[in-house]
Amino acid sequence: TLNSVLNSNAIKNLPPPLGGAAGHPGSAVSAAPGILYPGGNKYQTIDNYQPYPCAEDEECGTDEYCASPTRGGDAGVQICLACRKRRKRCMRHAMCCPGNYCKNGICVSSDQNHFRGEIEETITESFGNDHSTLDGYSRRTTLSSKMYHTKGQEGSVCLRSSDCASGLCCARHFWSKICKPVLKEGQVCTKHRRKGSHGLEIFQRCYCGEGLSCRIQKDHHQASNSSRLHTCQRH
């Protein structure tokens, strides 16, 4: 069960103790001294580290990916797991640590010169491969957006939204991800009511634009749950 997963102290891939260096005095921006953070200790140790439950990779940290903690485990029980280092096995880009991506099932370094070609090649392969699996996970990757010299325009291959130009987001299209327009007021949006349902979308929509949220369209309140239409509406 999820509880037993979350309460186990014998979980592999634990991150290092949380917490880091304080800001430097005299710098333009420094850590505020003496601030207690609501809801927890400033520093956490391995002993009380709890894996974070998740539905998609984007809910995890940049050095994590979202998956079932046991091989072939219950897909409904997913937690954030530590990313995999170079030469480790992988199924998708998000499983590999920053600076790496998944190629032929192995995490490899994202060499700046060959990076874009490699990614496009990987995506082309997956289009023509009957064994490509829609593995039920979001295709977010922790690769740095600095790998791209220019921001992607609509339809460009991307790995995460920061790879796309302003007003676009990186969303799934078949088994790749491309830059698509952020949704405007009145446009139909996707509200994920069921945990993990992100992974089922082959044609993913962007999120609603700034100042908008995805809500049930007023005249659809009476409709059955399954047919309710959500649109981007002002807060």
């Epitope: 949380l18 880091g20 953070y37 400033k42 940290g61 940049t62 050095d63 600095k146």
Partner: nanobody, 125 residues
Framework: KVQLVESGGGLVQAGGSLRLSCTAS????????VGWFRQAPGKERDFVTA????????AYADSVKGRFTISRDNAKNTAYLQMNSLKPEDTAVYYC??????????????????WGQGTQVTVSS
């Protein structure tokens, strides 16, 4: 290192709206958690809201739920705090803060390493 600058504060009447911006310099912004905190005169600095690196997760203090909305645009290295239905008790200096988002946890429990200088928000009755 990330340097943060807040803007958008000011004087507004009760019931009004303001939008604060937190602009970062430094390429690491897109991999940080960003939080907004506020400090009223003579009081401690309080957590207001936070958003994870991707925008997939947000958290709000009970006192602002339904009125404030946090968002971010990693392409612009900016986070936003949209404040609606403002009340006099929202008067405070608002600080933007950022921390590394390498490992997910409750958004109120991150260590915020970098802080802006703050922007004053005054709500008159």
């Amino acid at each position: 290192k990330v340097q943060l600058v807040e803007s958008g504060g000011g004087l507004v009447q009760a019931g009004g709206s303001l939008r604060l911006s937190c602009t970062a310099s430094g390429s690491a912004f897109s991999s940080t958690v960003v939080g907004w905190f506020r400090q009223a005169p003579g009081k401690e600095r309080d957590f207001v809201t936070a958003i994870n690196w991707s925008g997939a997760r947000t958290a709000y203090a009970d006192s602002v739920k339904g009125r404030f909305t946090i968002s971010r645009d990693n392409a612009k290295n900016t986070a936003y705090l949209q404040m609606n239905s403002l009340k006099p008790e929202d008067t405070a200096v608002y600080y933007c803060a950022a921390g590394r988002d390498r490992y997910a946890r409750d958004l109120t429990e991150y260590e915020y390493l970098w802080w802006g200088q703050g922007t004053q928000v005054t709500v008159s009755s």
